[in-house]
Amino acid sequence: IWELKKDVYVVELDWYPDAPGEMVVLTCDTPEEDGITWTLDQSSEVLGSGKTLTIQVKEFGDAGQYTCHKGGEVLSHSLLLLHKKEDGIWSTDILKDQKEPKNKTFLRCEAKNYSGRFTCWWLTTISTDLTFSVKSSRGSSDPQGVTCGAATLSAERVRGDNKEYEYSVECQEDSACPAAEESLPIEVMVDAVHKLKYENYTSSFFIRDIIKPDPPKNLQLKPLKNSRQVEVSWEYPDTWSTPHSYFSLTFCVQVQGKSKREKKDRVFTDKTSATVICRKNASISVRAQDRYYSSSWSEWASVPCS
């Protein structure tokens, strides 16, 4: 048993029928010694008396809020949560496996630049009685500070018969050095509690691996005289690291006809302009990627040819 936060405790249980469970001793937080009784949740049934209560925790029915009283007055509470271990593996029931980039990916994180700021998100089908707490650090043995905000519900989607809820959190490395080579990964830890169940999820990454620039901005077309060609120009996104001479991007320019089946013309360039042929009803799209480290491409920025 361990303390998650004040008056909230997690009991780790092997989740198979013959497992012995955990013997837990609760102590009433009071100087009183006599006349103390214990109850569980809203029940008035007295479970025991005395300053301590010993319980055998085996099932969710043994978890919940234990309260000690004296003469009708509440003295203290202890909330017991369960963390299930099935076949030697901690349960991962609360969050959905996003399966990207690989199976058992519950947390996904992205950074728009090298400033040490990043966003993580996760998915669940649970709509109520759900709380998250996020902690982060760089390295684990001698951790350096990363500050995370509160997790918030950022999107709701319908997936077949189910509703899916996306939560996200923003974190900032306290003493980020954008130009430095990373040697220790960022660790992100999410505590998830659904009713009486506790689970934890972790992700470990280097900022360089989760970089995804914003799309290029100010995408413009300039027709070239007496030609079907146009000059496409754009700018680095505002959120990208500076100076651009050091934090450089490379770009992919794509001409896409109305039909998805039509052949796409693609041009790769390190410049912020390119000359392409603009077909009727086509659109021109540009996306960006770190020039020196192949992390994710940005989303596309697009303009119609007409």
């Epitope: 249980l13 989740w15 198979y16 029928p17 013959d18 497992a19 469970g21 085996k58 099932e59 969710f60 029915g61 978890a63 299930k84 099935e86 029931d93 009713k195 009486l196 169940k197």
Partner: nanobody
Framework: EVQLVESGGGLVQAGGSLRLSCAAS????????MGWFRQAPGKEREFVAA????????DYADSVKGRFTISRDNAKNTVYLQMNSLKPEDTATYYC??????????????????WGQGTQVTVSS
């Protein structure tokens, strides 16, 4: 979508046996207390038996103790009710119910969140 599907009911002679099954989907099965209830024509629904999430705690109605056994297979998302030494008064529709994070001493049907459609058990004398 949560589904509980009972099977195994039928007609049996007094003293005989039946094994009811209830297959669950759409829930994290091992988090749920699973209960069996029954309702005879013109009577109130009554509690029969319940089993906690990992199967370490069981509860039975006095009328079936020693004759009925509840069990579960969390790998198969299924709960069973083995009924031996059946009596004509066991004739009823048997329902399976689920309660996430519940307690086995929930003998009131109102404490359960999800219900099956029921399977008929008839015991002839």
């Amino acid at each position: 979508e949560v589904q509980l599907v009972e099977s195994g009911g039928g007609l049996v002679q007094a003293g005989g046996s039946l094994r009811l099954s209830c297959a669950a989907s759409g829930i994290i099965f091992s988090d749920n207390v699973m209960g069996w209830f029954r309702q005879a024509p013109g009577k109130e629904r009554e509690f029969v038996a319940a089993i906690a999430g990992r199967g370490s705690r069981l509860d039975y109605a006095d009328s079936v103790k020693g004759r009925f056994t509840i069990s579960r297979d969390n790998a198969k998302n299924t709960v069973y009710l083995q009924m031996n030494s059946l009596k004509p008064e066991d004739t009823a529709t048997y329902y399976c119910a689920a309660k996430p994070y519940g307690r086995v001493f929930y003998t009131e049907g109102s404490n359960y969140d999800f219900w099956g459609q029921g399977t008929q058990v008839t015991v002839s004398s």
